[in-house]
Interface confidence: low
Amino acid sequence: LSTCKTIDMELVKRKRIEAIRGQILSKLRLASPPSQGEVPPGPLPEAVLALYNSTRDRVAGESAEPEPEPEADYYAKEVTRVLMVETHNEIYDKFKQSTHSIYMFFNTSELREAVPEPVLLSRAELRLLRLKLKVEQHVELYQKYSNNSWRYLSNRLLAPSDSPEWLSFDVTGVVRQWLSRGGEIEGFRLSAHCSCDSRDNTLQVDINGFTTGRRGDLATIHGMNRPFLLLMATPLERAQHLQSSRHRRALDTNYCFSSTEKNCCVRQLYIDFRKDLGWKWIHEPKGYHANFCLGPCPYIWSLDTQYSKVLALYNQHNPGASAAPCCVPQALEPLPIVYYVGRKPKVEQLSNMIVRSCKCS
Amino acid sequence: LSTCKTIDMELVKRKRIEAIRGQILSKLRLASPPSQGEVPPGPLPEAVLALYNSTRDRVAGESAEPEPEPEADYYAKEVTRVLMVETHNEIYDKFKQSTHSIYMFFNTSELREAVPEPVLLSRAELRLLRLKLKVEQHVELYQKYSNNSWRYLSNRLLAPSDSPEWLSFDVTGVVRQWLSRGGEIEGFRLSAHCSCDSRDNTLQVDINGFTTGRRGDLATIHGMNRPFLLLMATPLERAQHLQSSRHRRALDTNYCFSSTEKNCCVRQLYIDFRKDLGWKWIHEPKGYHANFCLGPCPYIWSLDTQYSKVLALYNQHNPGASAAPCCVPQALEPLPIVYYVGRKPKVEQLSNMIVRSCKCS
């Protein structure tokens, strides 16, 4: 039984254009296009254009939706953890004790054992078990950089709490660096936040693995709960696959517009407000690349005889293991427009208007 | 012409279960389930369980996918901007000049005029035109909190540059606060980052609107380019709709599992690895709530006679203005598993395994 159908591309485009007509009006909560009777002639006021451009700049600077996940993210990640070097290690003696900081060091040989190649690392988190905290505390995390210099990484505002709680800092980039370099021991510093005005801040928060006096002796609480790095990485044997065969392409404009892909892909569609919708009321832009998703996402029967070949198709055609996978937008971007209500120009941002990439979902 | 079909729910579930069988193996790059011959008897080692639990904690703490957008996010946002109060205003005299900070004040009456209700604000960005910068500079943004105290908001590492560049800070929460409070004038402070050790930092970066001496005189560069707040908000007249009729429900487990929704919704499906897949090789968890998406997403012809009624349907049934909208997962969560390869226990994280909500796309 064949369920193949010839796709009428023109009908699909027409339906997409008509859908956009309704979408724009619906987003603006307009039952019909606004009257243009009072619109002043001539170009848009400079201030309005400046505002429109500010909005466009924002769009250019930051895509509204997360980037499509790279192929590696589809595959399982092996999880390991590396505990902080015990605090009686001599490395801790090199760093002067202070009321505003605690230090945490890690053995890079242990890290390399868990993740042999920097490229395999998908995520690294520094996990700290925070004990009681009487007052709100603003803390900063630093990375040991060279001999005695520290590079700022991130900060956190900790709310007061009577119960212990795990804190997690994303340190993927730092650990990737450490895996690439030759150092034997690397570390972090957790400090109170000091502003240029107030510099007498004390680190009030108690981290399990350090005595309250911060002398560096291990606390008596279970050593497994001392600070550790939680690592998620692609196992080495699985990595060879990734390099040798890039089954999963990003179904984005770069790939789809320049290929003859028959399966799910983003298809080019420029909408000219005047020509396609018969609208003169949108003053900027004159049109936009709306695009659309089209193409089959075959359901894969995993009981197929050619099993290993079939499994390789999952990543592309049915990564979400849907019962009826469908070609839908993945990355979308907003569209700013300028139009008039009476004599008043308005700049509005319409969310999720431009299809940048598609996926089988 | 009716294209209605009776959905065979059991077949859909079976296809979803079979797809998951292939998906898990595919994510682990296994052609078949691993042999269990060498697996040691007895419970899992404590360290492995601790690691598995750490991974589960991470999942609980942060959903892998962004939250489904609230209804308000579908609708257009009016964009306005409010320029910083000119620096000859007396407010600037109240704050002592320093080498490490510049101050930016805003008239809240102007903010309220642009956004009459705090709930209408969708996004607020502080935009600063950064001029030349000779060295890397780590800056911090603070919010004026009470009389003369400042609350830390965020930080940025600025790379050296010869050309001007707009900097953008998300200050939505702060502006929402200001709109709720009675203050007449509110402000930000941009400061050099000072650590508790090194406190002699100078703000090297030049922001348009301030002389290099930071005396507070407006620079000669076009005043429109002085710091401003870019605001995106739901216009008041559009907001009444939102409160009165919540057309767009989150199609998530809370709603869908407790309703008889016929259209696109997330449907309950628990997969027991032993019973449903005949697998004994996954040691933790014993099963999981995979769920799936099902239900029609009607295409809406926007040329319909009942035009205003039709437009209200867009938000729910075809927000992306697709030519053939489809019910697909929106929020997904990962699944950590424990299994053995030979005698070695492995903890792995599988991305996008649990369907939390669906959408028409």
């Epitope: 309005v48 209500v341 120009p345 700049v347 | 409010v82 005029e113 005043g223 007249e237």
Partner: antibody, heavy 122, light 108 residues
């Protein structure tokens, strides 16, 4: 055709109150800011204040104690409530439609009513 | 508060003359300035906004220039219907809209 028609003027004794109205037609009243301006006989224009679409009002410093601006969008009408009137409040009172073009308060009066004369005299 | 000073307060000119009226702000108002024309017994009429943008329907013999504190309204060739009083107006600040005291253009 944009039309603004002021009413409610007349002769009033010092210390008394008066409410002026401005009926708007020919445009989408609820989405426009509106102003009141006055002109004493033989003198220049004095801005009294304006009201934004949401009902937020701003007034000149001198008008803050005694003058109140309000609007009823359902009736397409703008109001000016004047209390404790004095002889120096004698003027032609105009309502005008403001044109708010972003960024700053681009309050440009591009449509005016014909005005209504208020005479404060005992 | 900003003060707006218009000069001259009155001037006499003939049809066909080039007429210039100036307006000075007590502090910088960028280009947030409008010009109005008022004839006896009538409300004012907008001529120019944003210092130099001509309102729709206003003859091109009217032009505006300036930014910061100094502004000029120019009528390139005075016509009979141009005899009137002209006002400048600043609108740079949310709390105040200030008019100049006016310039009366009379027939010489």
């Amino acid at each position: 055709q944009v039309q603004l028609v002021e009413s409610g003027g007349g002769v009033v004794q010092p210390g008394r109150s008066l409410r002026l109205s401005c009926a708007a037609s020919g445009f989408h009243f609820s989405s426009e800011a509106m102003n009141w301006i006055r002109q004493p006989p033989g003198k220049g224009l004095e801005w009294i204040g304006y009201i934004y679409t949401s009902g937020t009002t701003y007034r000149a410093n001198w008008a803050r104690g005694r003058f109140t601006i309000s609007r009823d969008n359902s009736k397409n009408t703008l109001y000016l409530q004047m209390n404790s009137l004095r002889a120096e409040d004698t003027a032609v009172y105009y309502c005008a439609r403001g044109w708010h073009i972003f960024d700053h308060h681009y309050w440009v009066m591009h449509a005016w009513g014909q005005g209504t004369l208020v005479t404060v005299s005992s | 508060d900003i003060q707006m000073t218009q000069s001259p307060s009155s001037l006499s000119a003939s049809v066909g003359d080039r007429v210039t009226i100036t307006c000075q702000a007590s502090q910088s108002i960028s280009t947030y300035l409008a010009w109005y024309q008022q004839k006896p017994g009538q409300p004012p009429k907008l001529l120019i906004y944003a210092a130099s943008t001509l309102e729709y329907g206003v003859p091109s013999r009217f032009s505006g220039s300036g930014s910061g504190t100094d502004f000029t309204l120019t009528i390139s060739s005075l016509q009979p219907e141009d005899f009137a009083t002209y006002y400048c107006q600043s609108y740079s600040d949310g709390d105040s809209v200030i008019f100049g005291q006016g310039t009366k253009v009379e027939i010489k």
